[in-house]
Interface confidence: low
């Protein structure tokens, strides 16, 4: 249909403007649109000036590209004549309404295909797909290689020239190591290469008292160790020991008026017994602060354990479970209150219901047919447990709950009896005092560890097992073991540790297999009031890491051997420890100090909740972290 239209237009042009002269209006009737008419008519007048000598000035045939008026006029509507495209770069030219479209050859761009594409800078094909050097050329590009490499047949990748194979005796009895573009004569650690004899000579490091605390000698080397669990670390000289110093002081101020609910990893923090007149009803008022999402705030029961009430937190909301001779109920309601703010909570037994209020606003009203606890002999006897419940209760709950709750309460008033007697108990016991200010996170005080049982086997993967670790850390000391996998034979097949860096005010992260550092991330400023995000991915073939500064896949000659050691351990059973090491020999790892600071850990996509640990040191805080100590003008 388009070609028929073009032929019609061409015929009209012939009749109207070549066989006869046409004015602009007549030309408009030929083209039937303004852009083409406005483009055509001035050029038509130029053709007339050139060929219609009788009408205009004499034609200068010598300067005209066309032999006659017909050719000159017929060429006007063709935007591709004369060719507007760059001859080197164009593939075809398409005529349009008072416009043209140049289709470019590969390697060219621009309206007229006048610009060479720099394939070497193409973001979608980095470095033009060349493994080493990319050289851009007009309309094309080619790859080349650095010294010591040769180009492969695919013309993109470079292969290293193996000098060690070309000259087998180049290093004598030492090992010739081919490196990209060069070679090296290598000796095992603890030996040095002798150029004259072309051999490796042993270095005897441990013949003198090299180490301050403990020296372990082995063929080709030695290692000094310090007792990290007593707060020592190896000094920069790798021989003497120094105290692990605080790099980020924390505000560890506590108040005895604030009761810490997570004093015990397993067990009740406070137990009270009330004997009140039979007209009394259950009542509890307190201010409550936590970042924890699940756990027991308080549990109350009758003396004979026939009736009980549980006030807990689940999903950050208040949950009430109750059971007595009349009813068995579970209710959750109100807003999420694990926001780290002080929330006023009251639970009051009314005549026909139990009212739960947050900030004096009713959030739940639980109907009950009769009294919650039945009086006996004119007395209402009630036992109240803070932050836990007796062991036997666990199986009786309507819905199971993890009782551990990292939180604080203050301004409590139980059974309308005020705080009498309780403050006196708490005042004497430092462990029951809560920190004045806390932030979200988990806190490791540098004195203990948490243990988890995690199955790293991935049956759906060819790798067989994998360890994907994400750490969000805010250390307070620059040295300590953050995460360790420990085998049954007291070896540590994998550990992630922090050490103070040789460069001032920065830290290195060590990845180790047994007592060998397989990778060191150097000079990161981790001791700041901002959290740092670290990621590690390990399987039997690869080790990848991501830090605030870089993402990389680690590969070095010894790595596969170390990963094989790790692979063997992972096929047996390993225990996962956070914050330090259990009782393993000093020489089991490069670092043995406890980690001190805030840390949140995600392993294989699961955020580890310290409340779910197999065991945890009581001083580790599962869901609260002390604030950074701010210097005031007076201090």
């Amino acid at each position: 249909a388009n070609s028929l239209l073009e032929e019609t237009k061409q015929g009209n042009l012939e009749r109207e403007c070549i066989e006869e002269l046409c004015n602009k209006e007549e030309a408009r009737e030929v083209f039937e649109n303004d852009p083409e008419t406005d483009y055509f008519y001035p050029k038509y007048l130029v053709c007339l000036r050139s060929f219609q000598t009788g009408l205009f000035t004499a034609a200068r045939q010598s300067t005209n590209a066309y032999p006659d008026l017909r050719s000159c006029v017929n060429a006007i509507p063709d935007q591709c004549s004369p060719l507007p495209c760059n001859e080197d770069g164009y593939m075809s030219c398409k005529d349009g309404k008072a416009s043209f479209t140049c289709t470019c050859k590969p390697g060219w761009q621009g309206e007229k295909c006048e610009f060479d594409i720099n394939e070497c800078k193409d973001p979608s094909n980095i470095n033009g797909g060349c493994s080493q050097i990319c050289d851009n050329t007009p309309g094309s590009y080619h790859c080349s290689c650095k010294n010591g490499f040769v180009m492969l047949s695919n013309k993109k990748d470079c292969k290293d020239v193996d000098e060690c194979s070309l000259k087998p005796s180049i290093c004598g009895t030492a090992v010739c190591k081919n490196i990209p573009g060069d070679f090296e004569c290598e000796c095992p650690e603890g030996y040095r290469y002798n150029l004259k004899s072309k051999s490796c000579e042993d270095i005897d490091e441990c013949s003198e008292n090299m180490c301050a605390q403990l020296c372990v000698n082995y063929p080709g080397g030695y290692t000094c160790y310090c007792d990290g669990k007593k707060g020592f670390k190896l000094a920069q000289d790798q021989k003497s020991c120094e105290v692990v110093s605080v790099c980020l002081p924390l505000n560890l101020d506590t108040k005895y008026e604030l009761l810490y609910l997570a004093e015990q990893f397993a067990g009740v923090v406070l137990y009270l017994k009330f004997r009140l007149p039979e007209i009394s009803r259950f009542s509890a008022e307190f201010d409550f602060r936590t970042y924890d999402s699940e756990g027991v705030i308080l549990y109350a029961e009758s003396i004979d354990h026939s009736a009980w009430l549980l006030i807990a937190l689940r999903g950050g909301k208040i949950e009430v479970q109750l059971k007595n001779e009349h009813t068995s109920k579970i209710t959750t309601g109100g807003d999420v209150i694990n926001n780290g703010l002080w929330n006023m909570v009251s639970v009051e037994e009314l005549e026909h219901s139990i009212s739960i209020k947050i900030a004096k606003e009713a959030v739940m009203d639980i109907n009950k047919p009769g009294p919650l606890f039945k009086p006996e002999n004119g007395l209402l006897e009630t036992k109240v447990y803070f932050a836990g419940f007796p062991r036997k209760v666990e199986s009786e709950l309507i819905k199971p709950i993890n009782p551990r709750l990292d939180g604080c309460i203050r301004s409590w008033n139980l059974m309308k009896q005020g705080a009498s007697g309780i403050k006196e108990i708490i005042q004497e016991k430092q462990n029951k005092h809560c920190l004045v200010t806390v932030e979200k996170g988990s806190y490791y005080p540098g004195s203990g560890i948490a243990q988890f049982h995690i199955d790293y086997n991935n049956v759906s993967s060819a790798e067989g097992w994998h360890v994907n670790v994400t750490l969000n850390i805010r250390p307070s000391t620059g040295t300590g073991v953050m995460l360790a996998l420990v085998s049954g034979n007291n070896t540590v097949p994998f550990a992630v540790s922090l050490v103070d860096s040789t460069s001032e005010k920065s830290q290195d992260i060590l990845l180790s297999v047994e007592n060998t550092v397989i990778y060191r991330i150097q000079a990161l400023s981790l001791c700041s009031d901002q959290q740092s995000h670290l990621e590690f991915r390990v399987n039997r073939n690869n080790l990848e890491l991501s830090t605030p500064l870089k993402i990389e896949t680690i590969s070095h000659e010894d790595l596969q051997r170390q990963l094989a050691v790790l692979d063997k351990a992972m096929k047996a059973k390993v225990a996962t420890y956070l914050g330090g090491l259990p009782d393993v020999p000093f020489s089991a790892t490069p670092v043995n100090a406890f980690y001190n600071g805030c840390m949140e850990v995600n392993i294989n996509g699961v955020q580890l909740d310290l409340d779910e640990a197999i065991s945890k040191h009581n001083d580790i805080r599962a869901h609260s972290c002390p604030s950074v100590w701010k210097k005031t003008k007076n201090s």
Epitope: G315, G316, K317, I330, T331, T332, G333, V336, I398, K399
Partner: antibody, heavy 122, light 107 residues
């Protein structure tokens, strides 16, 4: 008695879309998480998707991730399931189900609608 | 995901007799297990939750037991209205999963 009434099912060609609705009544709709569960002809029950009481959190079975979208309008007491790029294997009766617990966590389903049949076929 | 396996697939019982249905989880679901009953052409109906708690209006002849990975639904004396398909459902972790069902038929 809680009432859940599904609608929007029907015959659709492979690659097509449907939007299911579930009208809820006789309970405090905005306090409960809701789910969609489906049952292919002659087969068992398969959980498809869930949405929190406020609608801020959504969960999907791997088989429908990226293809189905669950949503709710608490002002209209209505639950929705937008199904795109439908395949023959999505042919099933789709039930909407009420979460037993109120508040922000998820449990079993204490009430089910009568279901609406979705047939994906040429 | 947690795989729920029900056995037997079909159970033929005389009216008035006891029926015992089994449900096994591929990993622990604690007590977070529900049982649903579905009659032909009808929507499912909740029977038990928390492994052993009867839902509102469910007769005492239905009882549940078990925790962790092994669960049992028992119907002490089968009535004509009990012949249906029974499904177990775990609600311990995403995605929620159902067993393949046990069809209880008249012998």
């Amino acid at each position: 008695e809680v009432q859940l009434l599904e609608s929007g099912g029907g015959l659709v060609q492979p690659g097509g879309s449907l939007r299911l609705s579930c009208a809820a009544s006789r309970f405090s709709f905005s306090s409960y998480a809701m789910s969609w569960v489906r049952q292919a002809p002659g087969k068992g029950l398969e959980w498809v998707s869930a949405i929190s009481d406020s609608g801020s959190n959504t969960y999907y079975a791997d088989s429908v991730k990226g293809l189905f979208t669950i949503s709710r309008d608490n002002s209209k007491n209505t639950l929705y399931l937008q199904m795109n790029s439908l395949r023959a294997e999505d042919t099933a009766v789709y039930y909407c189900a009420k979460n037993y617990e109120s508040g922000g966590y998820y449990t079993f389903f204490d009430y089910w609608g009568q279901g609406t049949l979705v047939t994906v076929s040429t | 995901e947690i795989v729920m396996t029900q056995s037997p697939a079909t159970l033929s019982v005389f009216p008035g007799e006891r029926a015992t249905l089994s449900c096994r989880a591929s990993q622990s679901v604690r007590s977070n297990l529900a049982w649903h009953q579905q009659k032909l052409g009808q929507a499912p109906r909740l029977l038990l939750y928390g492994a052993s708690t009867r839902a509102t209006g469910i007769p005492a002849r239905f009882s549940g037991s078990g925790s962790g990975t092994e669960f049992t639904l028992a119907i002490s004396s089968l009535q004509s209205e009990d012949f249906a398909v029974y499904y177990c459902q775990q609600y311990n972790s995403w995605p929620f999963t159902f067993g393949g069902g046990t069809k209880v038929g008249i012998k």
